[in-house]
């Protein structure tokens, strides 16, 4: 789970070791701050939990792509 080091910066210190289906993911944000020990992706899940993931992992990249496409496609 992400940790807020102050009001403005949230960091990830550990990554999930289990892939989560994109069906269970709602959104994501990238963590690139130099104040954090590592680059990370924080997924917000359908049950509003935030989970830290490794942006180097293929499933993480695929999930971000999928969520990007979902955001770009207007819902009818």
């Amino acid at each position: 789970q992400p940790d807020a080091i102050n009001a403005a910066v949230t960091c990830c210190y550990n990554f999930t070791n289990r892939k989560i289906s994109v069906q269970r993911l709602a959104s994501y944000r990238r963590i690139t701050s130099s104040k954090c020990p590592k680059e990370a992706v924080i997924f917000k899940t359908i049950v509003a939990k935030e989970i830290c993931a490794d942006p180097k992992q293929k499933w993480v990249q695929d999930s971000m792509d999928h969520l990007d496409k979902q955001t770009q496609t207007p819902k009818t």
């Epitope: 289990r18 989560i20 069906q23 269970r24 899940t45 049950v47 939990k49």
Partner: antibody
């Protein structure tokens, strides 16, 4: 250690309803759900539906739609399954089982509740 | 609804033998969201394998799961007396629509 404790055996008349409870202890209720699974004598497992606590709503297998109601009381960490318009074919052991809504495998199970429908 | 078909219905083997149980899905099970359970008479099912190949806590190494897409396998490398039971597969890709296979009984030959 998570434990799910179910209510006791029930004998019901055809056409009546039954409400089975499932009390969870030793774990968080928040992003978890409870599924209800039944097993008729000598038969396999049949998923009836599930309730994810944070959503506050339930999903039901098509077969049971309109006849089953799954609810939960977060204050007491208890889930309920009510089945109405009972018939003899509903005689079965009813299990509750916990799952993490991020995944879905049923990692902890109740001991089961035998519901007998007989006139 | 994803239909899971298990085969064989019954497997008659001796202790020490290898058991191979199959579970075939009617549609692609994405993310390998498939589990295996063991059930003994009078007991609740017990989770053995999740995500097709990951062993649950406390499950002996002789149990292994494999497969993806529509074909999944549970293997018991060398049957112990306590392994004779019924085994079920379960898909959980859709939270609103879980399904189980009909079960495979592993009995003593």
């Amino acid at each position: 250690q998570v434990q799910l404790v179910q209510s006791g055996a029930e004998v019901k008349k055809p056409g009546s309803s039954v409400k089975v409870s499932c009390k969870a202890s030793g774990g968080t209720f928040s992003h978890y759900g409870i599924s209800w699974v039944r097993q008729a004598p000598g038969q396999g497992l049949e998923w009836m539906g599930g309730h994810i606590h944070i959503f506050g709503t339930a999903n039901y297998a098509q077969k049971f739609q309109g006849r089953v109601t799954i609810t939960a009381d977060e204050s007491t960490s208890t889930a309920y399954m009510e089945l109405s318009s009972l018939r003899s074919e509903d005689t079965a052991v009813y299990y509750c089982a916990r799952y993490d809504a991020h995944y879905g495998e049923l990692d902890f199970w109740g001991q089961g509740t035998l519901v007998t429908v007989s006139s | 609804e994803i239909v899971l078909t298990q085969s064989p219905a019954t497997l008659s083997l001796s202790p020490g033998e290898r058991a191979t149980l199959s579970c075939r899905a009617s549609q692609h099970v994405s993310d390998a969201y498939l589990a295996w359970y063991q059930q003994k008479p009078g007991q609740a099912p017990r989770l053995l394998i999740y995500d097709a190949s990951d062993r649950a806590e406390g499950v002996p190494a002789r149990f292994s799961g494999s497969g993806s897409g529509t074909d999944f396998t549970l293997t018991i490398s060398s049957l112990e007396p306590e392994d004779f039971a019924v085994y079920y597969c379960h898909q959980y890709i859709h939270l609103h629509s879980f399904t189980f296979g009909q079960g495979t009984k592993v009995e003593i030959k």
